[in-house]
């Protein structure tokens, strides 16, 4: 057991210790998306590469069918970047034509699905109006934060429009999580 | 040795333990860049402050000549933000003049150089079209993710145009990594 | 004490160990902001939800009056996202009217207050010119990095204009920190 002479007064001396290299971790990278059916009011989920190139899963963190599966309860840092690219959305022309003054937008959501709750929980959202003039456009949305997850929870990344996702490079669009 | 009575069933009881305060860590902050020669098809690398102000390196994580040097194999969280600023890129004027419909852009790449591979590996990329109208512009690109690195690997941050990097404040442009 | 036969040669064998679940951590989420008095040259600070929904504080990390209170010295990863939304800032019209060519902007600053320094320290800044055409706009600014903090330090998130912050959803605007 840890020598108490080294324990700060606030330390829970009997708390279980763990080797850091043993913690569940994953970094997933983008693949070309195959069109999938999704509910009208729900953004489609991306699927991912989990073992080639920079991608990996380890220590019982598994990837299956668009989901990262949480193998152990605890606090996780979860992150994702999605790079979008598209043709110009000419907002000024839209406005002049008398159509609604609502911009086009791009959105990324990291979602948790849990057995104990009927609805998915949106953990993180990055949403941006896209009102470019004059050219094709491209830009990333990055998200990352810490959440308390339960064993058996599933994580996915949803996007507003799968056809705008840049799937060309593993460093542009990715998704990861690790137990703290 | 840790008492097994406290070990969760999935714990590798004999894995080496480590004090968190002993792990390699670095947070580097921007400095004014001196123009350096770089290959035509390779983005130039930024150099960094490593000990003044908010910047630090510790526990054998060293900085030298634009590179963070990885002293120990393991999974690292790596992050960077680069704030860019520039004069207007009038995409609509460019387009009217009949020039190609390719927007100007800003790009940040976190790159790994490793002994075991002849080419640098792009770990993370943030790239954004810049097609502003009407004024000077400024904006950050943030990146962060987890990667498995080997002892002796070197990390750098490359940008598409060093002259657009905002080097005025240590909180605007930075680069860091820490062993998980 | 840890068995030395498992200790890598660089490990400080007598360094104190700590259970990860015992470390100070917090994830705070946005709430509707009440206008507060602030000094003319200082951006207003956001206040936060600390216990409902996705928000939590644990292991002596406390939230009070806009501040996260650091209970223990060490290296922390600190992050925030603020989603802004507003009506169009017609920069081109501003320019035509002969007014200064300074764009509107949105800024997020994560600030440290410490009793060993009379001024707040800006740890992280994300700042972006906003020069949209044709519509309402919305966009996030994300920040995250590692800093060495002292027991008793206080962290807050300041923004350039509190009225532009999207407070509608806990996944859009948030603030967190955890001891590494």
């Amino acid at each position: 057991l840890k020598g108490q002479e080294f324990a700060p007064s606030h330390q829970q001396v009997y708390a279980p210790l763990r080797a850091d290299g043993d913690k569940p971790r994953a970094h997933l990278t983008v693949v070309r998306q195959t069109p999938t059916q999704h509910f009208k009011n729900q953004f489609p989920a991306l699927h991912w590469e989990h073992e080639l190139g920079l991608a990996f899963t380890k220590n019982r963190m598994n990837y299956t069918n668009k989901f990262l599966l949480i193998p152990e309860s605890g606090d996780y840092f979860i992150y994702s970047q999605v790079t979008f690219r598209g043709m110009t959305s000419e907002c000024s022309e839209i406005r002049q034509a008398g159509r609604p003054n609502k911009p086009d937008s791009i959105t990324v959501v990291i979602t948790k699905v849990t057995d104990s709750y009927p609805e998915p929980t949106q953990l993180l959202m990055g949403t941006k109006s896209v009102c470019e003039v004059g050219s094709n456009w491209f830009q990333p949305i990055y998200l990352g934060a810490m959440f308390s997850l339960q064993e058996g929870d599933k994580l996915m990344v949803n996007v507003s429009d799968i056809s705008l996702v840049d799937y060309t490079k593993e460093d542009k669009t990715f998704f990861g999580a690790f137990l703290l | 040795l840790k008492g097994q009575e406290f070990a969760p069933s999935h714990q590798q009881v004999y894995a080496p333990l480590r004090a968190d305060g002993d792990k390699p860590r670095a947070h580097l902050t921007v400095v004014r860049q001196t123009p350096t020669q770089h290959f035509k098809n390779q983005f130039p690398a930024l150099h960094w402050e490593h000990e003044l102000g908010l910047a630090f390196t510790k526990n054998r994580m060293n900085y030298t000549n634009k590179f963070l040097l990885i002293p120990e194999s393991g999974d690292y969280f790596i992050y960077s933000q680069v704030t860019f600023r520039g004069m207007t890129s009038e995409c609509s004027e460019i387009r009217q003049a009949g020039r190609p419909n390719k927007p100007d852009s800003i790009t940040v790449v976190i790159t790994k150089v490793t002994d075991s591979y002849p080419e640098p590996t792009q770990l993370l990329m943030g790239t954004k079209s810049v097609c502003e109208v009407g004024s000077n512009w400024f904006q950050p690109i943030y990146l962060g993710a987890m990667f498995s690195l080997q002892e002796g690997d070197k990390l750098m941050v490359n940008v598409s145009d060093i002259s657009l990097v905002d080097y005025t404040k240590e909180d605007k442009t930075f680069f860091g990594a820490f062993l998980l | 004490l840890k068995g030395q036969e498992f200790a890598p040669s660089h490990q400080q064998v007598y360094a104190p160990l700590r259970a990860d679940g015992d470390k100070p951590r917090a994830h705070l989420t946005v709430v509707r902001q009440t206008p507060t008095q602030h000094f003319k040259n200082q951006f207003p600070a956001l206040h936060w939800e600390h216990e409902l929904g996705l928000a939590f504080t644990k292991n002596r990390m406390n939230y009070t009056n806009k501040f996260l209170l650091i209970p223990e010295s060490g290296d922390y990863f600190i992050y925030s996202q603020v989603t802004f939304r507003g009506m169009t800032s017609e920069c081109s019209e501003i320019r035509q009217a002969g007014r200064p060519n300074k764009p509107d902007s949105i800024t997020v600053v994560i600030t440290k207050v410490t009793d060993s320094y009379p001024e707040p320290t800006q740890l992280l800044m994300g700042t972006k010119s906003v020069c949209e055409v044709g519509s309402n706009w919305f966009q996030p600014i994300y920040l995250g990095a590692m800093f060495s903090l002292q027991e008793g330090d206080k962290l807050m998130v300041n923004v350039s204009d509190i009225s532009l912050v999207d407070y509608t959803k806990e996944d859009k605007t948030f603030f967190g920190a955890f001891l590494l």
């Epitope: - | - | 009793d115 008793g152 206080k154």
Partner: antibody, heavy 116, light 106 residues
Framework: QVQLQESGPGLVRPSQTLSLTCTVS????????MHWVRQRPGRGLEWMGR????????KYNPSLKSRVTITRDTSKNQVSLRLSSVTAADTAVYYC?????????WGQGSLVTVSS | DIQMTQSPSSLSASVGDRVTITCRAS?????MYWYQQKPGKAPKLLIY???NLASGVPSRFSGSGSGTDFTFTISSLQPEDIATYYC?????????FGQGTKVEIK
Amino acid sequence: QVQLQESGPGLVRPSQTLSLTCTVSGFDMQDTYMHWVRQRPGRGLEWMGRIDPASGHTKYNPSLKSRVTITRDTSKNQVSLRLSSVTAADTAVYYCVRSGGLPDYWGQGSLVTVSS
Amino acid sequence: DIQMTQSPSSLSASVGDRVTITCRASQGVEYMYWYQQKPGKAPKLLIYGASNLASGVPSRFSGSGSGTDFTFTISSLQPEDIATYYCQQWEGNPRTFGQGTKVEIK
């Protein structure tokens, strides 16, 4: 504008407890840290301790720790100092000081004499 | 405790002279502060973080140094600068002040 006003009895009997209050205005003291510093006649400055008004956390000068207590009442914008078991050596001007978060600012000081 | 040794304890200089006060810490500190105290008044912060001029302080005051050795300078002494000057470290517990340097006009 910013004000820090120390108040309390100017005379305290030996072995009694010295009590002073600092009332602040013009800023939110929870954005800062509040310190007490004293200056004995013809002597230099001595830091006594500080409180974080946001959390109530305190730090004290170890040489005074057994005798000093600093508290705050944020609803009244007040910070208080108590120094127990005083002797003539505690005769001093006592200053309330704001620091951290906002520029340093000192009260004008309160002279306390310990005498029977 | 971190001991602050300030020198000289007093000095006399003419108007317009350059005045230098030194402060040595018994161990390295990151931040050093310099205060001015006029008779019957509270101290006033002049320099923070070793070299930053506090708001409203004339530019003839400056500070420098790092680690254990710090210097405070008045580039051109003015009559209103007659005061006692203190260094202080604001980090270790307890915070400690130098014993003061009394500056007088010749």
